[in-house]
Interface confidence: low
């Protein structure tokens, strides 16, 4: 079995005489080792430095010689713990162990921050045997290291399915300073404090942060990095960025607008999509923001009537799509239409007004006193009503329609005619004896058909009665007037 | 939210008159296209339509019992009313009060839960 | 006055069933019909406005059309909460008419 020895284990001898790569008293390399692509780096680390205790695992071979005795346990050598070096150079560390030639197929891995470095890391196992042990070097070399590479490498040998875990190597890359939190551009209300913040690191520390506020600094005295600026208040646009200084130089970060909210700029280009008789489509383009979202619109309609009362309707909507039905329009009437829009600080002024029209409507009232009575003589029905009061609004009269429909027996039948609107008068073939005629018209403009006036019931008797007299609309609160002939 | 909310006697004798109170919250009539409506329903005879009131006094109602109806409307309050005159047990049911928004006859979008009435000697 | 009639008084179906509720205007209506669902002890909630219309977190298995003044309110793979009242209405003129209702029963 192998067991892991305690600090104080006496460290085993590197090799039992010289060989390439052994170190002199003064600890500088008699050879370096060349890497395997022919690569010299910029700083060589030797494998060992006498002295130094050990911390590693240590494994204990229970194998025993010619005379017994049980041989020393393995542990990789002490080497340099922590390399400090400028971004871009190269670095080449490595660690050494020597163990015994009974075994065979040993390999050593390496490791960075707790995880396997596979593949495309520069990495060379060499191996120096003598009669009894084996000295094994693994190197590892980094062409040109990046902040990235910082971290703690390890090497790690498997014998007998025990792991050997050597001490850790630092690597610390310097370089200029390193932002971690740059300020970002705002849109702020006008003279209202608001903060920046800017955050930079090392290595090496510490960093210190200037501000610059339109090419001017802020701070006359650095700050200790994270800095956070609170500027009390701007009447207009600024431009911030922030320098970060270490020793080894200095960084500036990205210059930051911070723009002042203000009020919309009016929309533009309001334009009619659709027109009906009583709504309106319309469309605009937003104006400028004014660096603050839009929250909603205002639809502003006016009648464009010079005899109007001027008043305003209002339709509040939201800032998209840029389209809104105007609803609750009069027909055929002119109106004006303007659209503004507003932001946290407030309302645009009002786009330039267009003017709109809505088409005819249908009419809003049914013909009146609608009379129904039989002319037995020529078998027709004749049937009399008085024009309705059209408004402007409802259009141009066209016609009439009139509805008729038949009911005998149980046989219902209807029937349409349309009729000119210069009468007021209209003459219908009788359709059944023996039945009930009911009538409705209504009026007809280019809007459309309007309300059917109430139903007017007749009967038409068999043929050969005489006494008939005309039906025709009830007065208020009497229903379906039916008048037997 | 959008809630209505009616409120009435709940009994009343024949010739009575009934006085009924829409209250309604999470809009207002002041608000340009608006309005409220009433609508009973009778065990028999399915939902009926009786009268509305716009955001600008417009009303309308049913003709067949127009000449017993009265709709009003408090707009501070957020209040609809609706009396019915002379009432005779025909006038049984639950009595609601809904909304329309957009100005136009249109759908009834929110309803009250309702607040039944027996007229009964 | 326009009448609204809902000939079906009741209807019986079963769950995942495909089932249609007709209503038939007087006279022309346009598209301004509404549907409206009553549940027991409930007010009316609108289903489908103008004519085809999904009210607002109304399940897409409600659909609306119309056939010149024929209206038809058809429920795809019904559910057991379907149960209801379903009720059209105009809004084409004043005074606003109601159909007469078509109850749903779940077999």
């Known amino acids: 079995a192998i067991t892991e020895a305690r600090e104080e284990a006496k460290p085993y001898p590197l090799f039992p005489g010289p060989f390439p790569g052994s170190l002199q008293t003064d600890h500088t390399p008699l050879l370096s080792l060349p890497h395997a692509s022919g690569y010299q780096p910029a700083l060589m680390f030797s494998p060992t430095q006498p002295g130094r205790p050990h911390t590693g695992n240590v494994a204990i071979p229970q194998v025993t010689s010619v005379e017994s005795k049980p041989l020393p346990p393995l542990a990789f050598k002490h080497t340099v713990g922590h390399i400090i070096l400028s971004e871009h150079k190269g670095v080449k560390f490595n660690c050494s162990i020597s163990v015994p030639n009974i075994y065979q197929d040993t390999t050593i891995s390496w490791w960075k921050d707790g995880k396997e470095l596979l593949g495309a890391h520069h990495a060379i196992t060499q191996f120096y045997p003598d009669d009894e042990v084996t000295a094994i070097i693994a190197s590892f070399s980094i062409t040109s290291v990046q902040r990235s590479d910082n971290g703690s490498y390890i090497c790690k040998m498997k014998i007998n399915n025990e792991e050997i875990v050597s001490d850790p190597i630092y690597i610390e890359v310097q370089g200029l300073p390193h932002f971690t939190k740059q300020p970002e551009s705002m849109n702020v209300t006008r003279n209202t404090a608001f903060n920046l913040t800017c955050q930079a690191v090392g290595p090496p520390e510490p960093v210190n942060i200037f501000w610059v506020q339109n090419s001017s600094r802020v701070n006359e005295q650095p700050e200790k990095s994270p800095s956070v600026l609170t500027v009390p208040g701007l009447t207009e646009m600024a431009v911030f960025s922030c320098e970060a200084h270490n020793d080894k130089g200095l960084t500036v970060s990205k210059g930051v607008q911070i723009n002042i909210k203000a009020i919309p700029s009016p929309p533009t280009e309001v334009s009619i999509r659709n027109s009906t008789a009583h709504s309106i489509l319309i469309s605009w383009v937003p104006g400028f923001d004014g660096y603050s979202p839009f929250r909603n619109c205002s639809i502003q309609v006016k009648e464009a009537d010079p005899l109007s009362n001027g008043s305003v309707m209002i339709f509040n909507t939201s800032a998209l799509p840029h389209l809104y039905q105007i609803k609750q329009l009069q027909a055929l009437a002119n109106y004006s239409i303007g659209v503004s829009c507003m932001n946290e600080i407030g309302w645009s002024a009002v786009s330039p007004w267009i003017l709109a029209s809505t088409t005819e409507g249908a009419p809003s009232v049914a013909p009146l006193n609608v009379t129904v009575f039989l002319n037995e003589s020529s078998d027709n029905v004749d049937i009399r009503w008085m024009k309705p009061p059209t408004k402007q609004q409802d259009g141009e009269l066209v016609g009439y329609r009139i509805s008729h429909v038949w009911q005998s027996a149980g046989i219902s039948k209807e029937l349409l005619e349309e009729v000119g609107q210069n009468g007021s008068r209209a003459r219908i073939s009788v359709q059944v004896h023996n039945a009930t005629c009911t009538v409705r018209i209504a009026a007809v403009t280019r809007g459309g058909v309007g309300p059917f006036s109430d139903p007017v019931k007749i009967f038409i008797p068999a043929h050969g009665w005489v006494d008939y007299a005309p039906s025709s609309t009830p007065a208020p609160g009497n229903a379906d007037p039916v008048l037997i002939i | 939210q959008v809630t209505l909310r009616e409120s009435g006697p709940g009994i009343l004798q024949p010739s009575q008159t009934l006085s009924l109170t829409c209250s309604f919250s999470g809009f207002s009539l002041n608000t340009f296209g608006m309005g409220v409506g009433w609508i009973r329903q009778s065990s028999g005879k399915g939902l009926k339509w009786l009268a509305h009131?716009?955001?600008?006094?417009?009303?309308f109602y049913n003709p067949a019992l127009k000449s017993r109806l009265t709709i009003s409307k408090d707009t501070s309050k957020n209040q609809v009313f609706l009396k019915i005159a002379n009432v005779d047990t025909t006038d049984t049911a639950t009595y609601y009060c809904?909304?329309?928004?957009?100005?136009?006859?249109?759908?009834?979008?929110?309803w009250g839960q309702g607040t039944p009435l027996i007229v009964s000697s | 006055d326009i009448v609204m009639t809902q000939s079906q008084k009741i209807m019986s179906t079963s769950v995942g069933d495909r089932i249609s509720v007709t209503c038939k205007a007087s006279?022309?209506?346009?598209?301004?019909v509404v549907w409206y669902q009553q549940k027991p002890g409930q007010s009316p909630k609108a289903l489908i406005y103008?004519?085809?219309y999904r009210y607002s977190g109304v399940p897409d298995r409600f659909t609306g059309s119309r056939s010149g003044t024929d209206f038809t309110l058809t429920i795809s793979n019904v559910q057991s909460e379907d149960l209801a009242n379903y009720f059209c209405q105009q809004y084409n003129s004043y005074p606003f008419t109601f159909g007469s209702g078509t109850k749903l029963e779940i077999k």
């Open positions: 009131i716009w955001w600008d006094d417009d009303k």
């Open positions: 006279q022309i209506v346009g598209t301004n």
């Open positions: 809904a909304r329309i928004e957009g100005g136009l006859p249109y759908y009834y979008d929110y």
């Open positions: 103008s004519t085809s």
